[in-house]
């Protein structure tokens, strides 16, 4: 297993619709053809997997049908979008990149993107 540098923004504020997008960029030391991207969430010292996708270079990222993540790839960059976020989902989202094929296997883990999610203010009751 060889180490690889992964860069991602330090902080992002999700949209009022609970959508956050950020780029995860990795310094590929070679010509990988198969890449696996995993998003991990760290909050309260707990780390959980949010979503993961394996893709062939030049192809679309394919997440599971029920995943809250979508993404596109371009060269050594992966543009990740996480949807359906609520205030309780605020936390550090870490991008993990694995170059699966061909060997050697490379692993890179970013420093994380702090995603803040602000629940929209409830609309005041209105009389009609």
């Amino acid at each position: 297993c060889k180490a690889m540098h992964v860069a991602q923004p330090a902080v992002v504020l999700a949209s009022s619709r609970g959508i956050a997008s950020f780029v995860c960029e990795y310094a590929s030391p070679g010509k990988a053809t198969e890449v696996r991207v995993t998003v991990l969430r760290q909050a309260d010292s707990q780390v959980t997997e949010v979503c993961a996708a394996t893709y062939m270079m030049g192809n679309e990222l394919t997440f599971l049908d029920d995943s809250i993540c979508t993404g596109t790839s371009s060269g050594n960059q992966v543009n990740l979008t996480i949807q359906g976020l609520r205030a309780m989902d605020t936390g550090l989202y870490i991008c993990k990149v694995e170059l699966m094929y061909p060997p050697p296997y490379y692993l890179g883990i970013g420093n994380g993107t702090q995603i803040y999610v602000i629940d929209p203010e409830p609309c005041p009751d209105s009389d009609f």
Epitope: V11, V12, A14, A87, T90, I118
Partner: antibody, heavy 116, light 108 residues
């Protein structure tokens, strides 16, 4: 090294607007947020809101909603805070700061005086 | 909004003594998103602690933070002459983010 340099002191009349700038250097501007905090003379710190320089999304303090606008110009690594319909109780030192989880780097502050 | 109440308002101590500053929240602060700042007259605040207990870059280890939920503490183990200042806590776990009213640590 990381630096945040704010625009100079302003004197405004009640009802006017003020726009304070905050020029960042020494880091990747779009990777961080910019938070705005103000401090009235002899008083404590008041959070005004923040902007994500990555995507331009903003989160404002409820009491300033409708009067404040925070923006960024990523081409010049500069953040702006505009406050409208100024009142005498808006007289304060306005600070910008680089935000992630706390403000680790601060601007020097901009004194805004609202007086007729 | 979450109201932060700092106590005491003023703490009179001598250099070398231990300072314990409290910050109480009106509601639980999620993920321990609480920071402490130091401010001296005429200067911008300085971040000491973030995420309740993580020291910011360059902060000496005599400063430590602890707590969870609604009760948080900043401890200065041995006060140095440069530590006499006003200290603020800030929560950023729930919008709007808020500051406490401050605790002044003065020389006895």
């Amino acid at each position: 090294q990381v630096q945040l340099v704010q625009s100079g002191a302003e004197v405004k009349k009640p009802g006017a607007s003020v726009k304070v700038s905050c020029k960042a250097s020494g880091y990747t501007f779009t990777s961080y947020g910019i938070s705005w905090v103000r401090q009235a003379p002899g008083q404590g710190l008041e959070w005004m809101g923040w902007i994500s320089a990555y995507n331009g999304n903003t989160n404002y303090a409820q009491k300033l909603q409708g009067r404040v606008t925070m923006t960024t110009d990523t081409s010049t690594s500069t953040a702006y805070m505009e406050l409208r319909s100024l009142r005498s109780d808006d007289t304060a030192v306005y600070y910008c700061g680089r935000w992630v989880r706390g403000v680790e780097y601060w601007g020097q502050g901009t004194l805004v005086t609202v007086s007729s | 909004e979450i109201v932060l109440t700092q106590s005491p308002a003023t703490l009179s101590l001598s250099p070398g003594e231990r300072a314990t500053l409290s910050c109480g929240a009106s509601q639980s602060v999620s993920s321990s998103y609480l920071a402490w700042y130091q401010q001296k007259p005429g200067l911008a605040p300085r971040l000491l602690i973030y995420d309740t207990s993580s020291r910011a870059t360059g902060i000496p280890d005599r400063f430590s933070g602890s707590g969870s939920g609604t009760d948080f503490t900043l401890t200065i183990t041995r006060l140095e002459p440069e530590d006499f200042a006003v200290y603020y806590c800030q929560q950023y776990g729930r919008s709007p983010w808020t500051f406490g009213q401050g605790t002044k640590v003065e020389i006895k």
